[in-house]
Amino acid sequence: VPLSRTVRCTCISISNQPVNPRSLEKLEIIPASQFCPRVEIIATMKKKGEKRCLNPESKAIKNLLKAVSKERSKRSP
């Protein structure tokens, strides 16, 4: 499980690998703060509601964010 309440940052392990945008329930981008010095990206999957931490520095994850924002802009009027 990549999440923990016992450390200041939410993510313990992060993945460089993208996921299929269509399988995402939610994508949270948590900015760096006094509690955690790095940006964290948490993907909640539609299947089983599983949460995954994604590496914001990974090119593949940046591509995923681009794809998701493009999808959102298509949907919004």
Epitope: V19, P21, K59, A60, I61, N63, K66
Partner: antibody, heavy 119, light 107 residues
Framework: EVQLVQSGAEVKKPGATVKISCKVS????????MHWVRQAPGKGLKWMGW????????TYADDFKGRFTFTLDTSTSTAYMELSSLRSEDTAVYYC????????????WGQGTTVTVSS | DIQMTQSPSSLSASVGDRVTITCKAD??????IAWYQQKPGKAPKLLLH???TLQPGIPSRFSGSGSGRDYTFTISSLQPEDIATYYC?????????FGQGTKLEIK
């Protein structure tokens, strides 16, 4: 040494199913996504999609939705590509390619598997 | 999907010639282009990524440049072993696309 070793050439009849394997060595299998690329005889390279090796979740390019299935066996560090209801136009060389996700490009390729569909 | 238009589709040159291949994307790909060499019966081999970064072990006669939508791959002095087909790949999107390829022959 990082290696992707694919299964041997296949000759199949139209309507049959083929399953190609891509066994990796020299790195941790679940650290990199695995992509598949098709090359028809005398033609260029066409990206087919990828599988997330941590979750097993496949993603298919639009032209490769329906008859194509990407799967994994993480215990043997092997990726598979299965193609059903074979047609003559599926005759091609199929490559697996590791994506160096952090930077985003394909850095290591399998040697290719030739699939020939002929009645 | 991002479309990549590669030209020329074939090219004949002499040993020692400077050879240039171009790829044009239909939108800005932010320098996220790689170049591959494929010899007959072999898998593609990565030469350059991020427009101009040479892979370890690749001779310095291979180079790349460009930005925005327009990219160039150059062999400064063609060698007999460079006879192959060359492909560009854009990876600025989750949906990858290759150029159509350029077949390079010796005159």
């Amino acid at each position: 040494e990082v290696q992707l070793v694919q299964s041997g050439a296949e000759v199949k009849k139209p309507g049959a199913t083929v399953k190609i394997s891509c066994k990796v060595s020299g790195y941790t299998f679940t650290d990199y996504s695995m992509h598949w690329v098709r090359q028809a005889p005398g033609k260029g390279l066409k990206w087919m999609g990828w599988i997330n090796t941590e979750t097993g979740e496949p993603t298919y390019a639009d032209d490769f939705k329906g008859r194509f299935t990407f799967t994994l066996d993480t215990s043997t560090s092997t990726a598979y590509m299965e193609l059903s209801s074979l047609r003559s136009e599926d005759t091609a060389v199929y490559y697996c390619a590791r994506n160096y996700d952090y930077d985003g490009y394909f850095d290591v390729w399998g040697q290719g598997t030739t699939v020939t569909v002929s009645s | 999907d991002i479309q990549m238009t590669q030209s020329p589709s074939s090219l004949s040159a002499s040993v020692g010639d400077r050879v240039t291949i171009t790829c044009k994307a239909d939108q800005d790909i932010n320098k996220y282009i790689a170049w591959y060499q494929q010899k007959p019966g072999k898998a593609p081999k990565l030469l350059l990524h991020h427009t101009s970064t040479l892979q370890p072990g690749i001779p310095s006669r291979f180079s790349g440049s460009g930005s925005g939508r327009d990219y160039t791959f150059t062999i400064s002095s063609l060698q007999p072993e460079d006879i192959a087909t060359y492909y560009c790949l854009q990876y600025d999107s989750l949906l990858f696309t290759f150029g159509q390829g350029t077949k390079l022959e010796i005159k």
